[in-house]
Interface confidence: low
């Protein structure tokens, strides 16, 4: 399957549901459809409270049954491993594909973990992470943040992806904002004596 690179914030904002969950076993093929489903155990919901309503959780994640049509294949055998799943809601069910943002929770940087819980939501609907995959590329709007990891790092997993979110600076402007404590080391409080 060929997926467009996605910044974690884009994945968060464009998903109906973002949850932490564990995969409980092998997929089950659903007769008469081209889907299969994985049984999952949801541990935390990070986005989708409004869409879900009173539902206590999702027992299954549905995906196309064929890899050639971008079906997700879960490789880990570790049932205790927790995953971040950014998926879509279809007919009340959680749907994922090979292009879904779906990674072990512990693989996310601490900054990303914090952002999925709290920060990314502030940029949704207001700011857009705009991928720059070839030079030259330019900002098309003040609400865009230019994502250059693919060019500078040769990968979608780069500094902007790991440590930054595109957030409103004022009502008309979005900028990259650092997800950590500070970009610079704190200066020594006392000067050395001459």
């Amino acid at each position: 399957c060929s997926c467009a690179p996605t910044h974690p914030q884009t994945a968060f904002c464009n998903s109906d549901l973002v949850i932490r969950a564990k995969f409980m076993g092998s997929p089950e093929i659903i007769e008469t459809t081209l889907y299969q489903r994985y049984e999952i155990k949801m541990t935390k919901m990070l986005k989708g409270f409004d869409a879900v309503g009173n539902a206590t959780g999702f027992r299954f994640a549905y995906t196309p049954a064929m890899e050639s049509l971008c079906g997700y294949v879960h490789k880990s055998q570790n049932r205790s491993e927790e995953f971040l799943i950014a998926g879509r809601l279809r007919n009340g069910n959680l749907h994922i594909t090979a292009c879904s943002f779906l990674v072990p929770w512990h693989n996310l940087s601490p900054a990303q973990q914090k952002a999925f819980v709290k920060t990314y939501s502030a940029g949704c609907g207001v700011c857009t992470v705009f991928p720059c995959s070839a030079i030259p590329c330019k900002l098309e709007s003040d609400s865009h943040c230019l994502w250059t990891d693919q060019i500078l790092m040769g990968s979608e997993k780069g500094y902007q992806s790991d440590h930054f979110a595109c957030l409103p600076r004022n009502p008309d402007l979005c900028t990259w904002q650092y997800l950590g404590v500070s970009m610079t080391r704190s200066l020594p409080l006392a000067k050395a004596e001459a």
Partner: antibody, heavy 121, light 109 residues
Framework: QVQLVQSGAEVKKPGESLKISCKGS????????IGWVRQMPGKGLEWMGI????????RYSPSFQGQVTISADKSISTAYLQWSSLKASDTAMYYC??????????????WGQGTLVTVSS | DIALTQPASVSGSPGQSITISCTGT?????????VSWYQQHPGKAPKLMIY???NRPSGVSNRFSGSKSGNTASLTISGLQAEDEADYYC?????????FGGGTKLTVL
């Protein structure tokens, strides 16, 4: 070379049934999806559904689910599109197309010549 | 199904370059590198011109090129020729659904 040959034009009355065909040759018919696409007079292309002749797995567009049936007979390398009860709004050109779908490629690379279906009382 | 958005018509003179846009969502055009472009002359079947955003099938002129930025894909035809006059359709993919654009009529002046 890859060829998809469709059955000839049809003129039908509302309420009648119809089955049109698409015969593939020049490639392994059971190894590729076949899609059906509708084009109403003067309008654009609309994807209706796909079938994998190897095992007859079928997927429909929500717009066409329950309106048509897609099937295939792999022994004669032929895919079918059928209606149980035609409506005037089914008047259109219908194309079959081979879907290359695997790995990093996904496209309808070869098309049939089209079957014109006219439904009129 | 929501069709991808294309301009209804574009035009250009012989030798010029034109670009046709195709706007979708983060789920289809933006989510996968699966955008195809088809050319259709009146009374003929569609013909594949570009696949996987920017790849040309063998036999298609290198005057045709494709690209994508965000949720918008583009087809560019350089050195416009009379035989390029036709309808052009983009097509993308989203979770086992295939969606076409509304089509763009290209007129060579």
């Amino acid at each position: 070379q890859v060829q998809l040959v469709q059955s000839g034009a049809e003129v039908k009355k509302p309420g009648e049934s119809l089955k049109i065909s698409c015969k593939g040759s020049g490639y392994s018919f059971t190894s590729y999806w076949i899609g059906w696409v509708r084009q109403m007079p003067g309008k654009g292309l609309e994807w209706m559904g796909i079938i994998y002749p190897g095992d007859s797995d079928t997927r429909y567009s929500p717009s066409f689910q329950g309106q048509v049936t897609i099937s295939a007979d792999k022994s004669i390398s032929t895919a079918y599109l059928q209606w149980s009860s035609l409506k005037a709004s089914d008047t259109a050109m219908y194309y079959c197309a081979r879907l290359v779908g695997g790995g990093y490629d996904l496209m309808f690379d070869s098309w049939g010549q089209g079957t014109l279906v006219t439904v009129s009382s | 199904d929501i069709a991808l958005t294309q301009p209804a018509s574009v035009s250009g003179s012989p030798g010029q370059s034109i670009t046709i846009s195709c706007t979708g969502t983060s789920s289809d055009v933006g989510g996968y590198n699966y955008v195809s472009w088809y050319q259709q002359h009146p009374g003929k079947a569609p013909k594949l011109m570009i696949y996987d955003v920017s790849n040309r099938p063998s036999g298609v002129s290198n005057r045709f090129s494709g690209s994508k930025s965000g949720n918008t894909a583009s087809l560019t035809i350089s050195g416009l020729q009379a035989e390029d006059e036709a309808d052009y359709y983009c097509q993308s993919y989203d979770d086992m659904q295939f969606v076409f654009g509304g089509g763009t009529k290209l007129t060579v002046l």
